[in-house]
């Protein structure tokens, strides 16, 4: 009897030990994971994060769709709606260059760097060549008439516009439109002015920054968060808190991301900080990620979202700050009347798009999202979508704008910048991070469940045996 009882008690004890060990392994395992993650996400030489941060291992592509104007004469003569037809994608590989001038500052636990710009055309991923022609708004004419509202200057400009045979619209190749061309009208301006114009001019051989970000050595909750941009904590483009540089650059976030978090990030493309909110769980190549999206609230008017009041910088075009879905970034573009929106004026007020025909906004194609691996905070997939528009206003001094009867926010192009973790990187990530965490979780569960089952089974058996013996 003793042998059997002893055996049952031993089994129950072993079960209890396994269960306790499984239970202990949960917080201890989490601590180990946290310790490893905290060590590996710090931005310093030798960590996984640093290696991928210096030079992204992911191929990033920027696709462009150009809005080809179908009725330029009609618009210019009768102030008709602008009929556009999007043409694209024209794809470039971007952000393939390693960060430059990387300097660690141990005093304040920051690392500073420059992000070099470069773009390589990818013909196989494009519908045409860089020599394709498009009818687009004349950037120089629209910008000059806005920058110089003075009547005298406009009369002078008008004579130069006429002399150069420039008009409200122009035909330009893709390469010219994106990366720059010498404008014939600006070439006649008799005082020093840059005669080169382009939506992204200058781009190649330039760099964004200097960025100074926290390296996470003193506090992992600050890793990758921007301390200063171009030596300042503010942008000087907006009033109040709108001017602040918040969060990271969206390439990564501090680890242990929660679904309830609002992820702040700064984008120099749109000259402001913005935020993303959790939308759904996504499985990306076997890695569970959180999909965060830019909500429509971020593009709302101050009437709908009072937090946006300081992004409304003028009263006329914005119809006394009631328009939404477009952001006037002229202050950030040397006074050029550049307006940023989501593609096809997604989430924008009807008054913005009522002057444009041929737009079809839809969330799936035109919204921005970030797929973030929550434990590391790494962005493993993203789609940054934005549209660049130019304001053109009537001018009774500039002949080619004289017949316009209303303001137009003219879409020039929209872009989709995407990056997805490669298969090899995903496999490595699964084995090094997800795999290990899953394995640890599995071991914890097995130990706990086997232990509990053993303990309960052996204790029941023991109790049954004892009751039989007593009888």
């Amino acid at each position: 009897g003793c042998d059997r009882n002893c055996g049952l008690i031993t089994g129950a004890v072993i079960g209890a030990v396994l269960a306790v060990f499984g239970g202990i392994l949960m917080p201890v395992g989490d601590m180990l994971i946290q310790k490893t993650i905290k060590k590996e996400v710090v931005l310093e030489e030798g960590t996984i994060a640093f290696k991928n941060w210096v030079k992204t291992g992911t191929e990033i592509y920027r696709q462009f769709w150009i809005f080809d104007v179908q009725n330029p004469q009609e618009v210019m003569m009768n102030s008709s709606n602008i009929q556009v037809k999007q043409r694209g994608p024209y794809t470039y590989r971007v952000r393939f260059l390693a960060k430059e001038n990387i300097t660690q500052d141990p005093k304040d636990n920051t690392v500073s760097f420059l992000q070099p710009n470069g773009a390589i055309f990818e013909p196989s991923l494009s519908v045409g060549t860089e020599a394709d022609n498009f009818t687009v708004l004349n950037l120089a004419v629209a910008a000059a008439s806005h920058i110089y509202p003075n009547p005298f200057v406009q009369v002078v400009l008008n004579s130069l516009i006429n002399k150069s045979k420039s008009s409200m619209f122009q035909v330009r190749t893709l390469r010219e439109l994106l990366w720059g061309y010498t404008d014939p009208f600006l070439s006649l301006v008799p005082y020093p002015v840059s005669t080169r114009v382009g939506m992204f001019y200058p781009y190649n051989n330039t760099a964004d920054g200097v960025y100074k970000v926290f390296n996470g050595k003193d506090s992992i909750s600050k890793v990758a968060i921007i301390d200063t941009y171009k030596g300042k904590r503010n942008l000087s483009y907006w009033e109040s808190y709108c001017d602040m540089i918040n969060g990271t650059d969206a390439a990564s976030f501090p680890p242990f991301v929660e679904k309830s978090q609002v992820l702040q990030f700064f984008s120099s493309d749109i000259c402001r900080s913005i935020y993303a909110v959790f939308e759904s769980d996504v499985n990306l190549k076997g890695i569970p990620v959180y999909r965060f999206v830019l909500p429509s609230k971020a593009f709302a008017s101050p009437v709908q979202n009072p937090d946006n009041h300081c992004f409304c910088t003028e009263k006329i075009i914005s119809k006394n700050c009631t328009s939404y879905g477009v952001l006037d970034i002229s202050k950030c573009k040397e006074g050029k009347p550049v307006y940023i929106s989501l593609p096809h004026f997604l989430y924008a007020s009807p008054d913005v798009s009522e002057t444009i025909d041929g737009l079809n906004p839809n969330e799936e194609e035109h919204r921005t999202y970030l797929d973030i691996e929550p434990i590391t905070g790494f962005t493993l997939q993203f789609a940054k979508r934005l549209q660049v528009n130019l304001l053109v206003k009537p001018s009774n001094k500039i002949q080619v704008l004289k017949r316009l009867k209303r303001n137009y926010i003219v879409p020039i192009l929209w872009l989709n910048e995407t990056g997805t973790i490669g298969d090899e990187k995903a496999k490595m990530f699964r084995s090094q991070v997800t795999g290990k965490i899953n394995l640890l979780g599995l071991i914890e569960m097995i130990l706990l469940s086997v232990g509990v089952v053993m303990f309960v089974a052996f204790m029941i058996s023991y109790c049954a045996c004892r009751s039989k013996t007593i009888k």
Epitope: Y148, V155, V156, N396, K397
Partner: antibody
């Protein structure tokens, strides 16, 4: 309140030069064009030229090219017009006048009388 | 260069009467015509700017009309304080050009 204060009257000899000034206050000097207008005794007004202080862009009436030179000193918010090789034909009241955003010659100086006499 | 022909060169009207001054331009200037009043010993004063726009603070008895090459300036109900020289200015192109002026006197 926008004010344009011109320098006092000038009596000059034929062949000489004169530089008259127009000091402005009450507005952002660089954002508005400064024009100069000639009014001979009992006659109409003639536009001499204009200067946009922001970038120093000038435009002259062909008739006054070589006769008038327009300059500005941003630090003192002052516009200048130099007239050279003066003859009796140049005897007149010269006004500086400033644009407003969308309006020509919205504000005027009090005028400077230039008399060319041997 | 756009030349501006202003007529009449002078006119004498009774108080309370309606005054009409005309300017004709040598080229089409849309509605880029301005009207100025100059009293003796004073600089000109802008009354009406481009687009037949009455300037703030200017009495509503002053008005203008016209488009293209033919422009008319009107004073309804003439007052003694309206005695002055009146000039039109075309601002469509450079050089800016003034009309020859109209001397308005009271009968």
């Amino acid at each position: 309140e926008v004010q344009l204060q011109q320098s006092g009257p000038e009596l000059v000899k034929p062949g000489a030069s004169v530089k008259i000034s127009c000091e402005t206050s009450g507005h952002t000097f660089t954002e508005y064009t400064m024009h100069w207008v000639k009014q001979s005794h009992g006659k109409s007004l003639e536009w001499i030229g204009g200067i946009y202080p922001n970038n120093g862009a000038t435009k002259y009436n062909q008739k006054f090219k070589g006769k008038a030179t327009l300059t500005v000193d941003k630090s003192s918010s002052t516009a200048y017009m130099e007239l050279r090789s003066l003859t009796s034909e140049d005897s007149a009241v010269y006004y500086c006048a400033r644009d407003r955003y969308d309006v020509w010659f919205a504000y005027w100086g009090q005028g400077t009388l230039v008399t060319v006499s041997a | 260069e756009t030349t501006v022909t202003q007529s009449p060169a002078s006119l004498s009207m009774a108080i309370g009467e309606k005054v009409t001054i005309r300017c004709i331009t040598s080229t089409d200037i849309d509605d880029d015509m301005n009207w100025y009043q100059q009293k003796p010993g004073e600089p000109p004063k802008l009354l009406i700017s481009e687009g037949n726009t009455l300037r703030p603070g200017v009495p509503s008895r002053f008005s203008s009309s016209g488009y293209g090459t033919d422009f008319v300036f009107t004073i309804e109900n003439l007052l003694s304080e309206d005695v002055a020289d009146y000039y039109c200015l075309q601002s469509d192109n450079l050089p800016l050009t003034f009309g020859g002026g109209t001397k308005l006197e009271i009968k």
